[in-house]
């Protein structure tokens, strides 16, 4: 099984406790790469003014960004374990690319933003295994992520700050919403 | 001032309905989640629902499936809680709540509390 | 929805003694769990969150411990004010809270 980062042989066989369950492997897995997150969108904030943009003016931005919605079973009206797992992973597999985008984008946060690319990549693999509908996820096609990570890293710099905001606003609330899903589980 | 103020609450029939507002200041609740939680007179605080920001995501409590109902007016700065087929065991105050951006979060501002009287 | 059951109910207690309060999860919720203080009248306020941090402004003779499903707050020496009720919160899903415990003057 894939090595979850931040996790030591003592969280799954701690000495006078439990061992950690599937549900809490997974919500502390992603709970690192939302800590990853916070690290890479401080130094984001620190160096732009992006993070007082108001949300009108960040919704102008055409990212094609994976994002959740009540029809992809997540929710808890409506929530449909297969379905929502489905959605999960095929965002996460949407958001590589994206992922791939910010390795270049930090200075100071370089080996976070690589952990935070490589952890979500052992999340999926994790999840896939939990999943049983594996023929309805569909990757991303490489030649289609290659001609947008060209023209992502093609823009302007005050473009490139504000994807890299909006790309780092979006992977954390979707990875919360798959939380609250997971939970479920 | 970050501060949460609820209106809305009284007296109501069984059976009656009743919508609770709860109003934002300092902080935009289009970028936080919200929580309602009750206290009963004399009794221990119950939660009863939340709204996660992102994409409106709303949860509730087993007690009030199906007659409660939780949105928001992002224009209005504003959380409502909708209670329909009250029931006298509803009686109690409710507290509006915000849940830190955190994971886990926890409650970390709330509201003073309205008082809500379900008899006959 | 996660049940909360928090022990003992009632605590009798003097100034400067130590007290435990426990709260246990009806299933493994890791850390996602936060103890409130609550006086008469007042709407709760956060002591500590993520199961053992302690929040900001809060004095460090109340600390949290635990994780999974078996959870502790405690007062390491009683002050007057101390004598309130005190709840757990699971955040893990929804946000259910034990029954609470009164901490009472003995």
């Known amino acids: 099984a894939p090595v979850l980062p931040g996790e030591d042989s003592k969280d799954v066989a701690a000495p006078h406790s439990q061992p950690l369950t599937s549900s809490e492997r997974i919500d502390k897995h992603i709970r690192y790469i939302l800590d990853g997150i916070s690290a890479l969108r401080k130094e984001t904030c620190n160096r732009s003014n992006m993070c007082e943009s108001s949300k009108e003016a960040l919704a102008e931005n055409n990212l094609n960004l994976p994002k959740m919605a009540e029809k992809d079973g997540c929710f808890q009206s409506g929530f449909n374990e297969d379905t929502c797992l489905v959605k999960i992973i095929t965002g996460l597999l949407e958001f590589e690319v994206y992922l791939e985008y910010l390795q270049n984008r930090f200075e100071s946060s370089e080996e976070q933003a690589r952990a935070v690319q490589m952890s979500t990549k052992v999340l999926i693999q994790f999840l896939q295994k939990k999943a049983k509908n594996l023929d309805a996820i569909t990757t991303p096609e490489p030649t289609t992520n290659a001609s947008l990570l060209t023209k992502l890293q093609a823009q302007n710099q005050w473009l490139q700050d504000m994807t890299t905001h909006l790309i780092l606003r979006s992977f954390k609330e979707f990875l919360q919403s798959s939380l609250r899903a997971l939970r479920q589980m | 001032e970050v501060q949460l103020v609820e209106s809305g609450g009284g007296l109501v029939q069984p059976g009656g309905s009743l919508r609770l507002s709860c109003a934002a200041s300092?902080?935009?609740?289009?970028?936080?989640?919200m929580i309602w939680v009750r206290q009963a007179p004399g009794k221990g605080l119950e939660w009863v629902s939340d709204?996660?920001?992102?994409?409106?995501?709303?949860y509730y409590a087993d007690s009030v499936k199906g007659r409660f109902t939780m949105s928001r007016d992002i224009s209005k700065n504003t959380v409502y809680l909708q209670m329909n087929s009250l029931r006298a065991e509803d009686t109690a105050v409710y507290y509006c709540?915000?849940?830190?951006?955190?994971?886990?979060?926890?409650?970390?501002?709330w509201g003073r509390g309205t008082l809500v009287t379900v008899s006959s | 929805d996660i049940q909360m059951t928090q022990s003992p109910s009632t605590l009798s207690a003097s100034v400067g003694d130590r007290v435990t309060i426990t709260c246990r999860a009806s299933?493994?919720?890791?850390?996602?769990l936060a103890w409130y203080q609550q006086k008469p009248g007042k709407a709760p306020k956060v002591l500590i969150y993520?199961?053992?941090t302690l929040e900001s402004g809060v004095p460090s003779r109340f600390s949290g411990s635990g994780s999974g499903t078996e959870f502790t707050l405690t007062i390491s020496s009683l002050q007057p004010d101390d004598f309130a009720t005190y709840y757990c919160?699971?955040?893990?899903?929804?946000?259910?809270f034990g029954q609470g415990t009164k901490l009472e003057i003995k």
């Open positions: 709540a915000r849940w830190a951006d955190d994971h886990p979060p926890w409650i970390d501002l």
């Open positions: 300092g902080f935009t609740i289009s970028s936080n989640y």
């Open positions: 709204l996660y920001y992102y994409a409106g995501d709303t």
């Open positions: 299933q493994g919720i890791s850390s996602w």
């Open positions: 993520k199961a053992s």
């Open positions: 919160q699971q955040s893990w899903l929804g946000g259910s």
